[in-house]
């Protein structure tokens, strides 16, 4: 009789995670009598996958009935493949004995598992940055195999080029992870902008996975401040307006100071959004000029998103004769009316004795 050969016809088999794999093995002789065993890996640390004679292998079945007369087909079927099943599988013939003695091994079949990458997760900077600054966005995806993968970055549909990508581990592994960091230069118009991380892999059949991040989470657009005055003839009151424009995010506190003393503090809330995603806010202060002998220095102090306060000051000039006020940044006003002015909010007292 010819010398026994163990034939594993496929050098490699590729299977999608979750599917089943068939690993083929035939022997060329009925001699010697003895079981077939399947191992993953070679050498002393090899892992037993299937033993024809004994053991319980819930995910592994023999393709051919092992009791079939003169059976020489010892192919196996492994169900519900995961990336952890990747490796080289050896079909090994043993001679019956106590213990059984290894006779010959097949050349091995490498099982590679095609596993889809997880949905890319894009994370932005921990702290907000302002226009003209560069911020970094990170995209991560895990659990894919094989290692080859393509990652692209887009900002509002335009592909970005300033990014660095790593696939780990560098060597062989059952599955891989990708991490990419893109650098994005912010502009004041980026509140509604979006960055997209796009991952393409053989398992996705041309339908890439996308992860997104909104630049609104990363950007701070500081406000413009403008303080103006309109006079109100009646009661010698002056209306001073602080216009806070084009800011983002909405978190903003405005404080009015009269001659350095806090007059009123307000928090912005439920503001309408501008087309570009920024906000505007107008606050006004009614100043009773007849209650002042000297000029009044008004300061609009804005603290935006936890940043240092920005001030804009305005002097209301008090003179001997009342005079209609325009939108001048320095206004003169005279009056002798000593009575209180009280607006809708009791906190807003502007009477000085």
């Amino acid at each position: 009789e010819e010398e026994l050969q163990v034939i594993q016809p496929e050098k490699s088999v590729s299977v999608a995670a979750g599917d089943s794999a068939t690993l083929n093995c035939t022997v060329t002789s009925l001699i010697p009598v003895g079981p077939i065993q399947w191992f993953r890996g070679a050498g002393p640390g090899r892992e037993l996958i299937y033993h024809q004679k004994e053991g319980h292998f819930p995910r592994v079945t023999s393709v051919s009935e092992s009791t079939k007369r003169n059976n020489m087909d010892f192919s196996i079927h492994i169900s519900n493949i995961t990336p952890a099943d990747a490796g080289t599988y050896y079909c090994v013939k043993f001679r019956k004995g106590s213990p059984d003695v290894e006779v010959k091994s097949g050349a091995g079949t490498e099982l590679s598992v095609r596993a889809k990458p997880s949905a890319p997760v894009v994370s932005g900077p921990a702290v907000r940055a302002t226009a003209e600054h560069t911020v970094s966005f990170t995209c991560e995806s895990h659990g894919f195999s094989p290692r080859d993968i393509t990652l692209k970055w887009f900002k509002n549909g335009n592909e970005l080029s300033d990014f660095q990508t790593n696939v780990d581990p560098a060597g062989k592994s059952v599955s891989y992870s990708i991490r990419s960091t893109a650098r994005v230069v912010l502009t004041r118009r980026d509140v509604h902008s979006q960055v997209i991380c796009e991952v393409a892999h053989v398992t996705l059949q041309g339908d890439p996975l996308r992860g997104t991040a909104n630049l609104s989470e990363a950007i701070r657009v500081p406000p413009f401040l403008e303080v103006t005055q309109q006079s109100m003839r009646a009661d010698n009151q002056v209306n001073v307006t602080c216009q806070v424009t084009k800011f983002y995010p909405q978190r903003l506190q405005l404080t009015w100071l009269e001659n350095g003393n806090v007059s009123r503090t307000e928090m912005a809330s439920a503001l309408p959004e501008n087309k570009d995603g920024t906000y505007n806010w107008t606050s006004w202060l009614l100043v009773n000029v007849s209650a002042h002998r000297d000029d009044v220095k008004l300061t609009c102090q804005v603290e935006h998103d936890g940043q240092p306060a920005v001030n804009k000051s305005f002097s209301v000039k008090v003179s001997a004769h009342p005079k209609e006020q325009g939108s001048n940044t320095a206004a003169e006003n005279t009056g002798t009316n000593e009575r209180d002015y009280k607006d809708d909010d009791d906190k807003h007292h502007h009477h000085h004795h």
């Epitope: 003895g34 004679k53 092992s66 009791t67 007369r69």
Partner: antibody
Framework: QVQLVQSGAEVKKPGASVKVSCKAS????????INWVRQAPGQGLEWIAM????????HYNQIFKDRATLTTDTSTSTAYMELRSLRSDDTAVYYC????????????WGRGTLVTVSS | DIVLTQSPDSLAVSLGERATINCRAS??????????IFWYQQKPGQPPKLLIY???NLDSGVPDRFSGSGSGTDFTLTISSLQAEDVAVYYC????????FGQGTKLEIK
């Protein structure tokens, strides 16, 4: 290691039935055929039948086809041979044997069960 | 059915001498290049033990003084140098079709 443990000796009256058991261990029961062979006192070996525990496929010696029934219980890895309408010439040691190579041979044997048929 | 005939029915051989037992099949037991003949040894009060499979292959743990040969219809079991523990009855079995046994050969020491 492979072990086949058979049930104890039986004494039966002619016309009765006997059911001999064979409990297998040390291997995957459903992967190998079980044969039944008998040996009358001072006589040679006589093959009765064989069963594949994985699907209960059976092959019988024509001589025993009408009187012998082989069954298995895979939950306990036990094979059974029932012989009906016993006669005095059925007095024999009944062996179960496992076919390791699917060659229809008998690689491992139980120690035998003596069945005595006597009135 | 295939009928196997062993010869001789009994045999006495001196210790250290060669013992030869023959088995003839009523028709060929060869198939696909294999000869479906098996040899068993049975000692008193014990079950048979497989010695040789597929005509010429020594089973695990069997001393190499035992050997098998032959093809087609004629087969031989040889013990090259008889030992005292070899005293037994020897059976051939075929499985080209469903199993059948030869009638057995009793081997004794001369």
């Amino acid at each position: 290691q492979v072990q086949l443990v058979q049930s104890g000796a039986e004494v039966k009256k002619p016309g009765a039935s006997v059911k001999v058991s064979c409990k297998a261990s040390g291997y995957t029961f459903t992967n190998y055929w079980i044969n039944w062979v008998r040996q009358a006192p001072g006589q040679g070996l006589e093959w009765i039948a064989m069963i594949d525990p994985s699907d209960s496929e059976t092959h019988y010696n024509q001589i025993f086809k009408d009187r012998a029934t082989l069954t298995t219980d895979t939950s306990t890895s036990t094979a059974y041979m029932e012989l009906r309408s016993l006669r005095s010439d059925d007095t024999a040691v009944y062996y179960c044997a496992m076919d390791y190579g699917s060659l229809y041979a008998m690689d491992y044997w139980g120690r035998g069960t003596l069945v005595t048929v006597s009135s | 059915d295939i009928v196997l005939t062993q010869s001789p029915d009994s045999l006495a051989v001196s210790l250290g001498e060669r013992a030869t037992i023959n088995c003839r099949a009523s028709k060929s037991v060869s198939s696909s290049g294999y000869n479906y003949i098996f040899w068993y040894q049975q000692k008193p009060g014990q079950p048979p033990k497989l010695l040789i499979y597929l005509a010429s292959n020594l089973d695990s743990g069997v001393p190499d003084r035992f050997s098998g040969s032959g093809s087609g219809t004629d087969f031989t079991l040889t013990i090259s140098s008889l030992q005292a523990e070899d005293v037994a009855v020897y059976y051939c079995q075929e499985s080209r079709e469903l199993p059948t046994f030869g009638q057995g050969t009793k081997l004794e020491i001369k």
